[in-house]
């Protein structure tokens, strides 16, 4: 039986239950190196409290479909008086990037993942020509995800004294210059996330191999190589190379640009201090608000709700978008499904569209982006589910008594982006991370 | 690739103001950093500002800082801007470019350049 989702076969994947303190291991298509779950373990549970370890998926018991993977074990499980086996349900969702295994929730038998990845998607579009994992747990089994710095068109440029050179590079996955307006950055050859442009000539200096390591609590690498053999003449005879470390910077700031620390003989070391390499929940609520010890700062996106039927409405072009944020409440015109954000096409009103659902709801505030986004829309030709990402802006003197009101600044590849000036993205800082 | 039209230049005394517009067609609008550049005649093209795609960010020159404001209106597929309180040095070909490359201000690094639009400054 082919593997179902070769992309995701080269790597080991992590998933925690920080709940429970478990740590899961996942290879999809072959067996996890750990002897404790035995030779044949496609799921290994790790119980950190205990320090034992179980494989709650075989392997060789695999069954899948395009949206889901199973692996049974033939260890008895009792739900309700039956005897079942215990088992692990992945669901696959498309998503723009290779992702992340998500835990869910575990029953007495069955163990749910949900894993949103270009490798389910039913279009190669967001397929790269080479992507590694991009996140890792750290020690007290805290998520850094750096997904979200991954460009799925275009580079970064690293800040670097030197007149004659541009170092580009992305996050974890090759650079696309499909897109590319006619710049430098279009002689990039295929496959390269780290390119080095030389006037009108430019080099891969640097491919993704390995997933993102953590090597402190605070600090993140990523390797790049030069897989093709064949020595670049200005590189002394040594093979070019690239190492990203990522910081978390030890209080919230904006935003800062990759810089280029080290380099000799093409051997680029590269440091880029970013919030992204703090720990998720630092980052992030799946409420309106963000506050506390842990976040560092006071954020309050509540009062934009809409209360009584009433929507904030923002013109794209051939559409409208109804928007109810950080509440619970029915667009009317969205046919009870469930959306924060409603796409309706004006020259056909019944053509509606849920463009995320506030039950997937994401609130981030990150390298001084305030940004409230929503999953889980409708369906796209791509098998990509809509959604909606919402940038804020802090606007003391925003109209609708301080609200604002969101304004429609683009779509991509079903991704519909607004921004917004609000009173309420003001945010206030505590100082002791 | 992405077709750029500038407009809006012309001569203005210093002090004044003026309003330039940059109407793009062609590929996706969306997925562009957009830039305003300058060149005065006998100097190298500069940097004066830039918006990001997805967030409506902005980045300035210094020497533009608190004069100059750009902004877009994805609606018409445009790109502007707004030069108030000129000086005589801002008189150049002023330019709009895209780029998919994040955290630059080099003009190397944009593509799809226009024609251009002439800015005189004078009395």
């Known amino acids: 039986q082919a593997a179902p989702f070769p992309e995701l076969c080269s790597y080991t994947w992590e998933a925690v239950d920080t709940k429970n303190n478990v740590l899961y291991k996942i290879n999809i298509c072959g067996s996890v190196d750990i002897v404790q779950c035995g030779p044949s373990s496609a799921v290994c549970m790790h119980l950190l409290k205990t320090r034992t370890y179980h494989s709650v998926g075989d392997s060789v018991l695999r069954s899948a479909t395009r949206s889901l993977l199973e692996f049974n074990t033939t260890v008895s499980c009792d739900q309700q008086g039956t005897n079942h086996r215990v088992q692990s349900s992945i669901a696959f969702l498309c998503g723009k990037t290779l992702g992340t295994p998500e835990f869910v929730t575990a029953t007495e038998c069955v163990h749910y993942f949900e894993w949103r990845t270009t490798a389910a998607c039913k279009k190669d579009i967001f397929k790269a020509n080479k992507e590694v994992p991009c996140y890792v747990f750290d020690e007290e089994l805290r998520k850094h995800d750096l997904n979200p710095l991954i460009k799925l068109s275009g580079a970064y440029l690293v800040d670097d004294s030197d007149p004659d050179t541009s170092l580009f590079i992305n996050v974890c996955r090759d650079i696309d210059t499909l897109r590319d307006p006619g710049s430098q950055l279009r002689a990039c050859p295929p496959g390269t996330a780290a390119c080095l442009v030389r006037g009108h000539q430019a080099f891969d200096v640097g491919q993704p191999r390995d997933g993102l390591k953590v090597v402190r609590k605070d600090r993140l690498v990523l390797s790049y190589v030069r897989e093709e053999a064949g020595k670049l003449d200005f590189c002394d005879g040594h093979s070019p190379a690239v190492t990203i470390t990522f910081v978390c910077p030890s209080e919230r700031r904006e935003g800062t640009i990759p810089k280029l620390t080290a380099k000799s003989n093409c051997r680029y070391e590269i440091e880029w201090i970013t919030e992204y390499a703090c720990h998720r929940d630092y980052l992030e609520s799946k409420t309106c608000s963000l506050s506390g010890e842990q976040q560092d700062v006071s954020i309050d996106l509540t009062p934009l709700a809409q209360s009584g039927g009433s929507s904030y409405i923002s013109d794209g072009k051939e559409y409208l978008f109804y928007l109810n944020v950080c509440g619970e409440t029915e667009i009317q015109f969205c046919n009870k499904k469930q959306a924060a954000v409603c796409q309706v096409k004006k020259s056909d009103t019944s053509q509606v569209k849920a463009a995320g659902r506030y039950h997937n709801q994401t609130l981030r505030y990150s390298d001084g982006d305030l940004t409230l986004i929503y999953f889980g829309g409708d369906e796209c030709s791509s098998g990509f589910q809509r959604m909606s990402v919402i940038n804020f802006e802090c606007n003391k003197t925003a109209g609708n008594d301080g609200k604002g009101t969101p304004v429609f600044t683009g779509e991509v590849d079903c991704t519909y982006f607004f921004t917004w000036d609000t009173e309420y993205a003001c945010v206030h800082h505590h100082h002791h991370h | 690739d992405v077709q750029l039209v500038e407009s809006g230049g012309g001569l203005v005394q210093p002090g004044g103001s003026l309003r330039l517009s940059c109407a793009a067609s062609?590929?996706?609008?969306?997925?562009?950093?957009w830039g305003w550049f300058r060149q005065a005649p006998g100097k190298e093209r500069e940097f004066v500002a830039a918006?990001?795609?997805?967030?409506?960010?902005?980045s300035y020159a210094d020497s533009v800082k608190g004069r100059f404001t750009i902004s877009r209106d994805n609606a018409k597929n445009t790109i502007y801007l707004q030069m108030n309180s000129l000086r005589p040095e801002d008189t150049a070909v002023y330019y709009c470019a895209a780029s998919i490359v994040d955290f630059t201000t080099n003009p190397s690094h944009f593509g799809s350049w226009g024609q251009g639009t002439l800015v005189t400054v004078s009395s």
């Open positions: 062609g590929r996706t609008f969306n997925t562009y950093n």
């Open positions: 918006i990001r795609w997805s967030s409506s960010k902005t």
